[in-house]
Interface confidence: low
Amino acid sequence: AMDLILINSLPLVSDAETSLTCIASGWRPHEPITIGRDFEALMNQHQDPLEVTQDVTREWAKKVVWKREKASKINGAYFCEGRVRGEAIRIRTMKMRQQASFLPATLTMTVDKGDNVNISFKKVLIKEEDAVIYKNGSFIHSVPRHEVPDILEVHLPHAQPQDAGVYSARYIGGNLFTSAFTRLIVRRCEAQKWGPECNHLCTACMNNGVCHEDTGECICPPGFMGRTCEKACELHTFGRTCKERCSGQEGCKSYVFCLPDPYGCSCATGWKGLQCNEACHPGFYGPDCKLRCSCNNGEMCDRFQGCLCSPGWQGLQCEREGIQRMTPKIVDLPDHIEVNSGKFNPICKASGWPLPTNEEMTLVKPDGTVLHPKDFNHTDHFSVAIFTIHRILPPDSGVWVCSVNTVAGMVEKPFNISVKVLPKPLNAPNVIDTGHNFAVINISSEPYFGDGPIKSKKLLYKPVNHYEAWQHIQVTNEIVTLNYLEPRTEYELCVQLVRRGEGGEGHPGPVRRFTTASIGLPPPRGLNLLPKSQTTLNLTWQPIFPSSEDDFYVEVERRSVQKSDQQNIKVPGNLTSVLLNNLHPREQYVVRARVNTKAQGEWSEDLTAWTLSDILPPQPENIKISNITHSSAVISWTILDGYSISSITIRYKVQGKNEDQHVDVKIKNATITQYQLKGLEPETAYQVDIFAENNIGSSNPAFSHELVTLPESQAPADLGGGKMLL
């Protein structure tokens, strides 16, 4: 998953500026890229520390630049290293003086185990000295001064991995400064083989791609991509997915690209020479211009891409008919995914032609682990790879990469996964109040461990001693009432928080236990509340015969309607009444009662009563005389509450008659508010008075009312109360 590339810009050092740039393309390293001197390859090279800087043009790249005056300190071997999952990927390269006595044929040379190899150096300076050849800084071979050929060679008839290393050539009187270097890379396996036992057959790597002996994958040269390196990149681009670009005026001219072993170093496609500054001759293309175009049907040869096939033709030489290949594209993958810890099934969906297969789609975790699909399907236009992570955790947060690598090219799409910790309350819920069949709970959902925001909250509960599943209710407020509980039962409670997204249900929080109350007794029967005096009320009830042996008492609560005054009185259970004293005259009180054992009983309905009055009652109000006939009339009135009015007296007499000739009608039910006077004389005027009586006395009427009966034949009349002052 790490695409590490080292660009050696001008490996032959003259008086110009020279540099090394190490790029981690399409990858987010956890540890920084390092550039250093490769003392394994050359022990006795310069010891000066390198001045490594960030390459400002790229997000993940480091650079070392030597100014022209530092030329003398540059000769030697270098490496670039990137680490992923604790494993280092190291790319090696060399720099040497352009004025060296010899120059290598190539900067690196990759061979297969068992190959017949000639490592060659071209003589550029003639000296009367012996020539010497070193491997990794140790002498291996010399040529007498008069026998030094134009091409100095080291012959390895049957190359083995231990033959690999940096070979250098110089005259005996020279030094590191005048040495020429080339690096031999020997694949661990014979040609076209890979694997621990070298018994797997390599994919055919085209365009001078190299089969990696450990993975069987093709390492593609700069300018080509895909599973078999068949797909040419756009002009002047490189990297596994052709996302990197050469910024020079002439593209990748003068850039030597070094890739992880066993690839070694080469020019980008279209260039050759030790400095990669020579364009390919006509008919040649590819890295170091080593590939020859043999295009069918007279198709054009491009030095960067090879044969440019007409529509309907494909292949390196445009030799195959068929639908034009399409570089894969990753679709429908958001840039950022928030995931709840637990099981996670990410999906990579890709188009392209041919459609990517199961093996060609992978998912790379931030730590570099490569995942393969657990499930795979495709439609006419898309391949869908489904991966399974059995337990994704917050440390897995970071940049994941969906990678698709087909013969038509390679594409990678990074996306950010933010793994959230499922929320769990830190505290058990609190029981604020309980009854025999309910409990009021503060769910204490905060603080919680883990990540919000909280989408919903569940209160889980169950009886402790029953083998029942947990029941739950969704809650929105912190305070919630649980109803329909069993009396005298121990319950367990806990809270489960749910955050947004699939699998957002957190682990239930700490458990709280509580016990519901016993069922309360019913209220006393036959409750009656009557005034006893101006300052007392008497509450009575029928005797109570409880069903259990438990002690019980009657709790009486009385409160004033007019004032904020409340009192609770506990009365022994064997009594059947209580006198409520210290009350205020002419005040209304509300009383209720319940029978309590260890458990509180059920309250009765409210009873209301007034204490007796301490003043005379006010006159009845709204006195009306209606429905008058020749012999009768209806008198109606209203009385004010709260004056302990016990009766109403209606007094009437024929006008002009003596006082002692009046008739009194006493109405003992003060709730009656009208009365019909009968047996009156026709066409007669009567004087009517009405009084209210209470425990203090009678009210004082301010005036009398006049009533005139009708002649015998007339219809009834209303008299609106003609008032006559006494």
């Epitope: 929320p423 609190n430 604020i432 204490s444 959902s445 905060e446 603080p447 919680y448 990540d451 919000g452 925001p453 909280i454 929105t476 407020n477 912190e478």
Partner: antibody, heavy 114, light 108 residues
Framework: DVQLVESGGGVVRPGESLTLSCVAS????????MSWVRQAPGEGLEWVSA??????FYADSVKGRFTISRDNSKNILYLQMNSLRAEDTAIYYC?????????WGLGTLVTVSS | EIVLTQSPGTLSLSPGERATLTCRAS??????VAWYQQRPGQAPRLIIY???NRANDVPDRFSGSGSGTDFTLTISSLEPEDFAIYYC??????????FGGGTKVEIK
């Protein structure tokens, strides 16, 4: 480090309005309850209001006049105070609230005077 | 509303002495009581929560005890920085969340 910084206090006349803000940092603001507590000059602490998830709570003395709210995207807690009275004069503290008050701001002084 | 009564109102002690502050609730509040310290000109600071648990960075000379209606904050050996006002608070029955009137611990 948890930090709570109140602002918006000042001198107003009775009947006027004022909005206090509290900027929070150093903790997952959206995950915690937040509260306002006030302290009249030379007096003790009096809880004013709290917000927890979608629920808001108020002391009887401010109910109907004060409104608590929060902006989780900006990590800000607000207290909108209308119909201010002389007895609302106090230092108003913003506090991180888990039934008790874990962390407090330094407070902002509100003076209601004619 | 649950009323919290703190006593004494003022406690005059010397550094190194033991301080015992009490808080009485008008109703049963389980262990849902917190204690705060307020130094002059500063914001309150949580000292104890859930009656007995010390808050972060609070020295172990501070301890809390009690449940139901009677609670105690003890400072085993007073340091100069401990002279301040201490408030108790209940969160068993709310709203409202209520505080005690405070106990001032002053240098004798």
């Amino acid at each position: 480090d948890v930090q709570l910084v109140e602002s918006g206090g000042g001198v107003v006349r009775p009947g006027e309005s004022l909005t206090l803000s509290c900027v929070a940092s150093g903790f997952t603001f959206s995950s915690y309850g937040m509260s306002w507590v006030r302290q009249a000059p030379g007096e003790g602490l009096e809880w004013v209001s709290a917000i927890n998830g979608g629920s808001t709570f108020y002391a009887d003395s401010v109910k109907g006049r004060f409104t608590i709210s929060r902006d989780n995207s900006k990590n800000i807690l607000y207290l909108q105070m209308n119909s201010l009275r002389a007895e609302d004069t106090a230092i108003y503290y913003c506090a991180n609230w888990n039934s008790f008050f874990d962390y407090w701001g330094l407070g902002t002084l509100v003076t209601v005077s004619s | 509303e649950i009323v919290l009564t703190q006593s004494p109102g003022t406690l005059s002690l010397s550094p190194g002495e033991r301080a015992t502050l009490t808080c009485r609730a008008s109703q049963h509040v389980n262990t849902h009581v917190a204690w705060y310290q307020q130094r002059p000109g500063q914001a309150p600071r949580l000292i104890i929560y859930d009656a007995t648990n010390r808050a972060n960075d609070v020295p172990d000379r501070f301890s809390g005890s009690g449940s139901g209606t009677d609670f105690t904050l003890t400072i085993s050996s007073l340091e100069p920085e401990d002279f301040a006002i201490y408030y108790c608070q209940q969160y068993n029955n709310w709203p409202p969340l209520t505080f005690g009137g405070g106990t001032k611990v002053e240098i004798k």
